[in-house]
């Protein structure tokens, strides 16, 4: 029951966090956590990399033409997030949610 509740909350909150809080002032800890999540779990976006299209930061001029954060890149270099291509970006079926689900299953069960 605990796992199920955690899983539901993750699904509901991760995309919201990524779209509304990522790279926003005062949310540096969230930004850092999302970047770490994407790099360590080799994923991009909540469900897939296209989730980033709804991000307030990605849609703003401040993102410098990025379509995904640089932390989605297999090799992180400045502005690498401008190219949303499988050779460059972690394109995992199910995005970071799937990776997190697997991690939680392995560590909480």
């Amino acid at each position: 029951a605990y796992y199920q509740q955690l899983n539901t909350e993750l699904k509901e909150n991760l995309k919201d966090t990524m779209t509304k809080r990522y790279h926003q002032p005062g949310h540096e800890a969230v930004t850092s956590a999302v970047d770490q999540l994407q790099q360590e779990f080799h994923c991009c976006g909540s469900n897939n990399s296209q989730d980033w299209r709804d991000s307030e930061w990605i849609r703003s001029q401040e993102a410098g033409g990025r379509v995904v954060p640089d932390s989605c890149c297999k090799t992180v270099v400045a502005l690498c997030g401008q190219r949303d291509h499988a050779s460059n970006i972690y394109k995992v079926e199910g995005g970071c949610i799937t990776k997190l689900e697997t991690f939680i299953q392995e560590h909480l069960r």
Epitope: K20, R21, Q24, P25, G26, H27, E28, D35, E56, W57, R59, S60, Q61, E62, A63, G64, G65, D70, S71, V76, V77, A78
Partner: antibody, heavy 118, light 111 residues
Amino acid sequence: EVKLVESGGDLVQPGGSLKLSCAASGFTFSTYTMSWVRQTPEKRLEWVAYISSGGVTTYYPDTIKGRFTISRDNAKNTLFLQMNSLKSEDTAMYYCTSPRTGTGFAYWGQGTLVTVSA
Amino acid sequence: DIVLTQSPASLALSLGQRATISCRASASVDYYGTSLMQWYQQKPGQPPKLLIYEASNVESGVPARFSGSGSGTDFSLNIHPVEEDDLAIYFCQQSRKAPYTFGGGTKLEIK
């Protein structure tokens, strides 16, 4: 050409309120994050408010929180700063500003002067 | 809050000399290989003007006489050769952690 024009600055008594406006032109306003930065008479620069491009996220330093409210009207290309419970230390030139890409405030208006004094 | 300490508070140089302004942050302003430090120039009666962003990138239209360097907590702005037009106050600013903060400024005077 990017143009930011502030207005609304005035002489106001401590405890009073004031609403500043910033009219933007020459760029796609709705895709730009916006901030208000003020400069005290001693020339010190302070970042006082931020709003995301869509207006979803706002940020205020602790010295400002609860007294000032930043908002925007993307349909009218206008940024606002509602200032309440004004103190003498809020006396400053208030600038409307925005980044171009990445970090740093690339675009600045000419400023509007707010004087809080009895 | 990240405190930025600029030095010197003022400096007077002759034309053609090199100006070096330092900015020290109370915590690192680096993130993902980028130093989130900016430099501005403010002339009398004008708003600040962005010169350098992300520590070393020269803003479009800014003369090559201006350069920025540094990482972590220590940064510097160099102007060489100094020209008459450089008479101004120079500020550093970090955008690593909110609230974004500015240094106290360095006034450059021409001898």
